[in-house]
């Protein structure tokens, strides 16, 4: 597999913390860059087409040019990661007004309307319009694709031969924006939830408003929050068990900032999953309820999880974390029955917690069963 995240974290380790080279310590910094470049070359054959890899290679070339580094010379040994010192240069607060969405876009109008999209579990998708779907969407799919931001998820089967998948990789591209941010790429994979962009930075780069894009590690290796103030957007990425969850709060204006609706406008958070990718998990839930512990392989696209996980146990475990019998609770039950992996309980729980934090309409925190949704555009 593509090891670009390993390269990124080694570079980040070498260039942050108390032993890090100062900005004027060019030989040390160049050594770290040479190591980074070497690492990217070594993983090139497995990273073809990887957005984060692409971005890292270009970033290295730019940094080597800026610092006048030659590609010959010593390389650095990766150090253990340490926290950056207080007063880190990345903590600038003098961002221009254009880099604060609420101040600039809405100077003369009311507070913007915020929307929420989330992806978690098997995976379950909550769209910007509060539709709730369970999808197959195996492989790489666009979650968000607008003029400011591109989010791509890769979903892999939770069990061999299963149509039920979960998110194993997430790539977020923050596009270059005025004097606020350079293009930045964030990438997370199973067991690799970095607290930095692929170029090792934690903010929007060298522009005046760079601090309007910031990554904060909430729980090491488990919970990262990305604030993109210049577009009024907050993203939460978690690793729960083996898989990733994604949640975003974004102004409607940004959600709809799409130039080509025929191509860009097809993204999952906006349109939902195509009909042929949807799983009728509510029907599955009803059937499972009616059959008790008996497994209903026919009702589910996934192979059944071990027999040792009966319906009653799934219900009990989900009730424990999700006392309200809403769609998050039902998603939890579905995931336990189709995977046998108890971590999916936490995925549903945290997804709901993220809704509570990110959704602007507190009356819409819980979604309930209703008549069948109109499917997303195929």
């Amino acid at each position: 597999p593509c090891k670009i995240l390993k390269c990124n974290s080694e570079f980040w380790s070498a260039t942050s913390g108390s032993h890090a080279p100062a900005s004027d310590d060019t030989p040390e910094f160049c050594a770290a860059l040479r190591s980074y470049a070497l690492c990217t070359r070594r993983t090139a054959r497995t990273c073809r087409g990887d957005l984060a890899y692409h971005s890292a290679v270009h970033g290295i070339e730019d940094l080597m040019s800026q610092h006048n580094c030659s590609k010959d010379g010593p390389t650095s040994q990766p150090r253990l990661r340490t926290l950056p010192p207080a007063g880190d240069s990345q903590e600038r607060s003098d961002s221009p007004e254009i880099c604060h969405y609420e101040k600039s876009f809405h100077k003369h109008s009311a507070t913007p309307n915020y929307t929420h999209c989330g992806l978690f579990g098997d995976p379950h998708l909550r769209t910007f319009t509060d539709r709730f779907q369970t999808c197959k969407v195996q492989g790489a799919w666009p979650l968000i694709d607008n003029n400011y931001l591109n989010v791509q998820v890769t979903n892999t089967p939770v069990l061999p031969g299963s149509a039920a998948t979960a998110t194993s990789k997430l790539t977020i591209i923050f596009k270059n924006f005025q004097e606020c941010v350079d293009q930045k790429v964030y990438q997370a994979e199973m067991d690799e939830l970095p607290a930095a962009f692929v170029d090792g930075s934690k903010n929007g780069g060298d522009k005046h408003g760079a601090n309007s894009l910031k990554i904060t590690e909430k729980v090491s290796g488990q919970h990262v929050e990305i604030q993109a103030k210049y577009i009024g957007t907050t993203i939460v990425v978690r690793q729960v068990g083996r898989y990733l969850t994604f949640a975003v709060r974004m102004p409607e204006e940004v959600v709809n900032a799409v130039e080509d609706w025929d191509s860009q406008g097809l993204y999952l958070c906006l349109r939902g999953c195509p009909l042929n990718q949807q799983i009728d998990f509510q029907a599955f839930h009803t059937n499972a309820e009616g059959t008790g512990a008996r497994r209903l392989a026919a009702a589910s696209p996934a192979p059944t999880a071990p027999e040792t996980f009966p319906y009653e146990t799934a219900v009990a475990k989900c009730k424990e974390k999700l006392p309200v019998e809403d769609l998050y609770y039902q998603a939890c039950v579905f995931d336990l029955l189709t995977t046998g992996d108890v971590n999916f309980t936490l995925a549903a729980y945290y997804a709901l917690e993220d809704v509570k934090m990110l959704h602007s309409n507190k009356d819409k925190l819980h979604l309930y069963e209703r008549t069948r949704d109109l499917p997303g555009r195929a």
Epitope: T40, R41, I60, E61, M64
Partner: antibody, heavy 123, light 108 residues
Framework: EVQLVQSGAEVKEPGASVKVSCKAS????????IQWVRQAPGHGLEWMGW????????NYLQKFQGRVTMTRDTSTRTAYMELSSLRSDDTAFYYC????????????????WGQGTLVTVSS | SYELTQPPSVSVSPGQTARITCSGN??????ASWYQQKPGQSPVVVIY???KRPSGIPERFSGSNSGNTATLTISGTQAMDEADYYC???????????FGTGTKVTVL
């Protein structure tokens, strides 16, 4: 001595396919990628793609995607390049070449080259 | 896609120095190789990793690479050096190889 020996010249009609072989000797066949390069008469070198003899994995230049197929037979230490839907502008020498690599620096270059196979596409 | 540009031809008198350039965006951050191809023959690598010479290649062949330009230098050029020369790099992003347009060296 490391050597790559290619099959003989071919004359093909437009629309046909050609399969060029490249037999390796003097080294462990599965340890090095085989690259394919072509050169139209009087023109420069054009990289076409590679095959990993160990896994059979390939990577083709976009312009050849869908028309080229690179395969290998590890038992005979032979790599093959098949080009289909031939056109007159596919007339060229086709070279197989071993990709040599410095694993410390992760750099690579091409050495040695096969003697080349002239493929002429003409009606 | 990545492109490498070379002058179509370079002329040099015997014993003089021939310099062949190869230009590409931020080429100095990549490792360049150079190949010599004589009429009717397969190419042969004369320089790899910017400046290294394979065994059997005369010392008069040297290479350098910085900025946007790689250069192959033939010092004390001999008649036998008359050939086409191609630069080449590995584009790690696509895992493709790119050849320069080629330069015909004529020894007057």
């Amino acid at each position: 001595e490391v050597q790559l020996v290619q099959s003989g010249a071919e004359v093909k009609e437009p629309g046909a396919s050609v399969k060029v072989s490249c037999k390796a000797s003097g080294y462990t066949f599965t340890d090095y990628y085989i690259q394919w390069v072509r050169q139209a008469p009087g023109h420069g070198l054009e990289w076409m793609g590679w095959i990993n003899p160990k896994t059979g994995g390939t990577n083709y230049l976009q312009k050849f995607q869908g028309r080229v197929t690179m395969t290998r037979d590890t038992s005979t230490r032979t790599a093959y390049m098949e080009l289909s839907s031939l056109r007159s502008d596919d007339t060229a020498f086709y070279y197989c070449v071993r990709e040599d690599m410095n694993t410390v620096l992760a750099t690579s270059w091409f050495d040695p080259w096969g003697q080349g196979t002239l493929v002429t596409v003409s009606s | 896609s990545y492109e490498l540009t070379q002058p179509p031809s370079v002329s040099v008198s015997p014993g003089q120095t021939a310099r062949i350039t190869c230009s590409g965006n931020q080429l100095g951050h990549k490792f360049a190789s150079w190949y010599q191809q004589k009429p009717g023959q397969s190419p042969v690598v004369v320089i790899y990793e910017d400046k290294k010479r394979p065994s059997g290649i005369p010392e008069r062949f040297s290479g350098s690479n910085s900025g946007n330009t790689a250069t192959l230098t033939i010092s004390g050029t001999q008649a036998m050096d008359e050939a086409d020369y191609y630069c080449q790099v590995w584009d790690v992003i696509t895992d493709h190889y790119v050849f320069g347009t080629g330069t015909k060296v004529t020894v007057l």
